[in-house]
């Protein structure tokens, strides 16, 4: 069976939107009005992995682009990147672990924990216009909580 996917946008808990900044980077910033069209639309695929009531494994691709968020070690540091894939083979039910995030719902907010690197999360800075990153903290200054907005296909 084909992998189930939905289109969505994400905003952090400060209501910053995610936009492309160069070919392989996402930044988080506040957008208003017509500028909201700049925010990236994700194709969130529901993939194979450890699942529970509040934890669902997903992959986050960029809609109509052959780019996926992935987690790799760079200079010994778990790092978030946008990775190009062969569109003929993706998305798939059994995604490589670096592409998998545990979508965790807590109090109507979402966290995205790396499956490859437990206790590392898709994060944004409090500061405006900074790259989205894989962070190792929760409950401090950096932001790990998101809301999801559904986008019709």
């Amino acid at each position: 069976a084909p992998v189930r996917s939905l289109n969505c946008t994400l905003r952090d808990s400060q209501q910053k939107s995610l936009v492309m900044s160069g070919p392989y980077e996402l930044k988080a910033l506040h957008l208003q009005g017509q500028d909201m069209e700049q925010q990236v639309v994700f194709s969130m695929s529901f993939v194979q992995g450890e699942e529970s009531n509040d934890k669902i494994p997903v992959a986050l691709g960029l809609k109509e682009k052959n780019l996926y968020l992935s987690c790799v070690l760079k200079d010994d540091k778990p790092t978030l990147q946008l990775e190009s894939v062969d569109p003929k083979n993706y998305p798939k039910k059994k995604m490589e672990k670096r592409f998998v995030f545990n979508k965790i719902e807590i109090n109507n907010k979402l966290e995205f924990e790396s499956a490859q690197f437990p206790n590392w999360y898709i994060s944004t800075s409090q500061a405006e216009n900074m790259p989205v990153f894989l962070g190792g903290t929760k409950g401090g200054q950096d932001i790990t909580d998101f809301t999801m907005q559904f986008v019709s296909s």
């Epitope: 010994d76 206790n119 500061a127 190792g136 903290t137 929760k138 401090g140």
Partner: antibody, heavy 118, light 108 residues
Framework: EVQLVQSGAEVKKPGASVKVSCKAS????????MHWVRQAPGQGLEWVGL????????VNNQKFKGRVTMTRDTSTSTAYMELSSLRSEDTAVYYC???????????WGQGTLVTVSS | EIVMTQSPATLSVSPGERATLSCRAS??????IHWYQQKPGQAPRLLIK???NSIYGIPARFSGSGSGTEFTLTISSLQSEDIAVYYC??????????FGQGTKLEIK
């Protein structure tokens, strides 16, 4: 009130090890990156390394080639930095500081003077 | 490793005058630069974060600007208590976090 309180001054002989502590209070210890920065007498600031209390990840300045070990105790909100094989050039004030991911170190400990002398 | 270069090494400014301190990064760091003040015998104190973001409790005479590789810390009207060493630090690409070598600010 956010506070980082460090252990007292140490005098060590070359080749020995030293372990400095940094007790955090007034904030969520696991919500920040905890750094160690040192300053030799009359010199500038040098980043030693960091620990992430939430997941116990550590990374340090390659200059120290495995001589630095950073640990933490989340039950007491304390970070530790141990430096081994001490040499005279390690004589410095060692500071702990907290930051966000991009390294804005907004609170610092008072510093711990480590003197290495035969 | 990103190298941060500060200039001048020493700056002498008259009380009430403007002081301008510079920091150059060896590669593009966006706005991921932070400025610190350190007085003798004290720990550094964060003055400005993310190139231009002010810090609660820091006097408004301190401001920062720049992006990419060129950055400036400005003290609009120098006070005697501003005599200190000032450091810039990058957090865009780590490890390692790197500091500039410092600018010593003196009263003329």
């Amino acid at each position: 009130e956010v506070q980082l309180v460090q252990s007292g001054a140490e005098v060590k002989k070359p080749g020995a090890s030293v372990k400095v502590s940094c007790k955090a209070s007034g904030f969520s210890f696991t919500g920040y990156y905890m750094h160690w920065v040192r300053q030799a007498p009359g010199q500038g600031l040098e980043w030693v390394g960091l620990i992430i209390p939430h997941n116990d990840y550590t990374v340090n300045n390659q200059k120290f080639k495995g001589r630095v070990t950073m640990t933490r105790d989340t039950s007491t909100s304390t970070a530790y930095m141990e430096l081994s094989s001490l040499r005279s050039e390690d004589t410095a004030v060692y500071y702990c500081a907290r930051s966000d991911y991009y390294g804005a170190m907004d609170y610092w400990g008072q510093g711990t003077l480590v003197t290495v002398s035969s | 490793e990103i190298v941060m270069t500060q200039s001048p090494a020493t700056l002498s400014v008259s009380p009430g005058e403007r002081a301008t301190l510079s920091c150059r990064a060896s590669q593009n760091i966006g706005t991921s630069i932070h400025w610190y003040q350190q007085k003798p015998g004290q720990a550094p104190r964060l003055l400005i974060k993310y190139a231009s973001n002010s810090i609660y409790g820091i006097p408004a005479r301190f401001s920062g600007s720049g992006s990419g590789t060129e950055f400036t810390l400005t003290i609009s009207s120098l006070q005697s208590e501003d005599i200190a060493v000032y450091y810039c630090q990058q957090g865009a690409s780590w490890p390692p976090f790197t500091f500039g070598q410092g600018t010593k600010l003196e009263i003329k």
